[in-house]
């Protein structure tokens, strides 16, 4: 194939791949008709003048995972057809001015995972056709004004995993075509008003894992096309009332891992397309009426690991499409009987790791499609008669780690568990805490004939008995339904998939699989 270097493999499709530690310089001679060249995992430390001079038809050049620390300014001369250039995962600290001069067709430039200390406006001034610029995983401490002014066609810019402490409000002002801006894992403490005003086509903004303490009220007011906004793992303690008011296209918002103490009614919205809202690991203590009422299409609401002790009866008004509600690991002692009444499509609710002492008999009265309820590790001594009777789709119920009082009043719960066991997960069985003579015994095998008669006045009202398990073909007698599909945490789609970690349900969000965001 027009002379393929011995260290490389060359395919009929004009693709050349050179790999291996024995390679210490760009192999020669390279086939003149090569359109794609990959130099990977070598010991090349520098690129000298014009090593690619004779392969002017080259469209894609990947020089990745090498020891590359020095590049001569004319290294890419004569590559006027090049559209894709990756220098990712090398050891570059400095980019020579003019390095990309003459690369008039360049659309994608990947400089991620190097050791770059700075960039200058002159670096990219010739790259007027650039659509994608990846600079994440470097050591950049600031971006000078004008650095991206010539990149008017840029649609994707990744500056994540650097050491940026501040951003000039003018640095992105000419990027009117930008769709994706990633600034995650930096050291930003605040974002000046107007920083994103020019980004009228922005669809994704990633600001997670910074040190942002305050959001300017109008920070996102010009970003009407924003679909994904990642603000998790910052120091945000309050949300200005209008900060999310102009985001009609938003469908993913992450705010977990901040210092939010309260949520004011109307703070979210209108956001008719928002499907998921992640608020775990904050300091929220109460939820007022109508706080989520603008989120008509919300399907996932995660409020776990806060300090919620009070939920107003109308807190979840408007959430008619909600499927998953996580309230675990809070400070809830009581719940109003109507608090979930509007959640007609709810399938999973996690209430474990709270201080719930009792539940109203009608707590799940309108939530007929519930498939999973987690109530473990609370202060429950009993549950009202018939509380689960109408939940024909329930296939996972966790009740362990509660101080169940096994007197005669426990019989309805015990009977329900026994008669419905094929539909429930094979989880840890509830154990009696009192009276002393049955402490430690399984609730479902206590001897009913020696159960202590109840002498107390019932604390919670029951509601009318209804068949808990209709004898119809839709619930086959012998079918053992497995556990419902559980939630995953937000995946910000650029995250390295190696961050996947499996967690126990007692862990972060009470769901089994988690991907770090």
């Amino acid at each position: 194939y027009h002379g393929c270097p011995s260290e490389c493999t060359c395919s009929r499709a004009s693709q050349v791949e050179c790999t291996g530690a024995r390679i210490v310089a760009v192999p020669t001679p390279l086939p003149w008709n090569a359109m794609s060249l990959q130099i990977l995992n070598t010991h090349i430390t520098e690129l000298n003048e014009s090593p690619f001079l004779n392969i002017s038809a080259l469209i894609a050049l990947r020089i990745e995972k090498n020891e590359l620390s020095r590049i001569t300014p004319g290294a890419f001369r004569n590559l006027g057809s090049l559209r894709y250039l990756s220098l990712a995962n090398n050891k570059l600290q400095v980019l020579p001015i003019g390095l990309f001069q003459g690369l008039d067709s360049l659309e994608s430039l990947l400089l991620s995972s190097n050791q770059l200390l700075q960039i200058q406006p002159a670096h990219f001034s010739q790259c007027s056709n650039l659509k994608e610029l990846q600079l994440h995983g470097n050591h950049l401490e600031y971006i000078p004004d004008g650095a991206f002014d010539h990149l008017v066609g840029l649609t994707k810019l990744n500056l994540g995993k650097n050491s940026l402490t501040h951003i000039s409000p003018r640095v992105f002002q000419h990027l009117g075509n930008l769709q994706v801006l990633r600034l995650y894992e930096n050291r930003l403490t605040d974002i000046p008003m107007g920083t994103f005003d020019g980004l009228v086509n922005l669809q994704e903004l990633a600001l997670q894992q910074n040190q942002i303490g305050l959001l300017s009220p109008g920070l996102f007011h010009n970003n009407h096309n924003l679909q994904r906004l990642y603000l998790s793992n910052n120091h945000i303690s309050q949300l200005p009332p209008s900060v999310f008011m102009q985001l009609p296209q938003l469908n993913r918002l992450t705010l977990f891992g901040n210092s939010l103490k309260e949520l004011s009614p109307g703070i979210f919205g209108p956001m008719p397309n928002l499907r998921e809202l992640w608020l775990y690991d904050n300091h929220i203590s109460s939820l007022p009426d109508n706080v989520f009422s603008n989120l008509r299409q919300l399907q996932v609401l995660i409020l776990s690991r806060n300090q919620i002790s009070f939920i107003s009866p109308g807190a979840f008004n408007g959430l008619t499409e909600l499927r998953e509600l996580s309230l675990h690991t809070n400070a809830l002692q009581d719940l109003d009987g109507n608090v979930f009444r509007m959640l007609a499509n709810l399938q999973n609710i996690s209430l474990q790791n709270n201080r719930l002492r009792q539940l109203p008999g009608n707590i799940f009265a309108n939530v007929n499609g519930l498939m999973a309820i987690q109530l473990q590790n609370n202060q429950l001594e009993n549950l009202p008669l018939g509380i689960f009777d109408h939940l024909g789709k329930l296939c996972e119920l966790r009740l362990y780690d509660n101080p169940w009082r096994c007197d005669s009043d426990i019989l309805p719960l015990r009977n329900w568990l026994l008669l419905n066991q094929p539909r429930l997960g094979t989880d840890t069985v509830p154990v009696c805490f009192s009276p002393a003579n049955v402490r430690g015994q399984s609730l479902i095998i206590i001897n009913v004939n020696v159960a202590v008669p109840s002498v107390h006045v019932p604390e919670v009202p029951s509601y009318p008995e209804t068949p808990w398990y209709p004898d119809t073909p839709s619930y086959p007698d012998t079918t053992s339904v497995s556990s419902t599909t559980e939630l995953t945490s937000p995946v910000e789609d650029y995250t390295d998939l190696t961050t996947i970690q499996v967690t126990d349900d007692r862990s972060v969000w009470g769901m089994t699989q988690a991907q770090s965001g």
Partner: antibody, heavy 113, light 111 residues
Framework: QVQLVQSGAEVKKPGASVKVSCKAS????????IHWVRQAPGQGLEWMGY??????KYNERFRGRATLTRDTSTSTVYMELSSLRSEDTAVYYC????????WGQGTLVTVSS | DIVMTQSPDSLAVSLGERATINCRAS??????????MNWYQQKPGQPPKLLIY???NQGSGVPDRFSGSGSGTDFTLTISSLQAEDVAVYYC?????????FGGGTKVEIK
């Protein structure tokens, strides 16, 4: 003490129906399941179904022929079996609780032409 | 349906000797870490009486000489020292899932 008292023996013709009662006493009637089990002469035990809080569950072999009902005012449960045939000749028992901890004395139903 | 198979069909044991009855389920009857296997005693002309529930728990008023063991699919009822009043038919039963099914019975007699 806990007692389950069943109605007396019945003789029925094939195609007819029979309704057997089981009156409970000595415990809170609504707190326990009542099962029905039958035993053909010289044979083993066969579970027919249960009733609890007006919810019922049947063995598929008896679905459509057996009907379980209850009257909480009299603490009585009823088992009605229709379209009787000779092989339905058996002693019919009611039994309390999930674990069948107390049983009625049994009601012999004879189906014969 | 879960099929329960008892063995032996009949058993003759001397007074004061140990009697052992086995029951095998066609599939596991364990749930929640508990074995839903029960044992009943039936004397002629009487209704059955609960002896053991959930594999190893004694019913009310049942003498200590009756014990149950096993898990999964294989279970055993043991009468440690057979008494004259223990002559009866013994049935195992699974209550893991509907329809609840009984074994065919084991007749215990005095040798």
């Amino acid at each position: 003490q806990v007692q389950l008292v069943q109605s007396g023996a019945e003789v029925k013709k094939p195609g007819a129906s029979v309704k057997v009662s089981c009156k409970a006493s000595g415990y809170t009637f609504t707190s326990f399941v009542i099962h029905w089990v039958r035993q053909a002469p010289g044979q083993g035990l066969e579970w027919m179904g249960y009733i609890y809080n007006d919810g019922t569950k049947y063995n598929e072999r008896f679905r459509g022929r057996a009907t379980l009902t209850r009257d909480t005012s009299t603490s009585t449960v009823y088992m009605e079996l229709s379209s009787l045939r000779s092989e339905d000749t058996a002693v019919y028992y009611c039994a309390r609780d999930y674990y069948f901890d107390y049983w009625g004395q049994g009601t012999l139903v004879t189906v014969s032409s | 349906d879960i099929v329960m198979t008892q063995s032996p069909d009949s058993l003759a044991v001397s007074l004061g000797e140990r009697a052992t009855i086995n029951c095998r389920a066609s599939e596991s009857v364990d749930y929640y870490g508990i074995s839903f296997m029960n044992w009943y005693q039936q004397k002629p002309g009487q209704p059955p009486k609960l002896l053991i529930y959930a594999a190893s728990n004694q019913g009310s008023g049942v003498p200590d000489r009756f014990s149950g063991s096993g898990s999964g699919t294989d279970f055993t009822l043991t009468i440690s020292s057979l008494q004259a009043e223990d002559v009866a038919v013994y049935y195992c039963q699974q209550s893991k899932e509907v329809p609840y099914t009984f074994g065919g019975g084991t007749k215990v007699e005095i040798k």
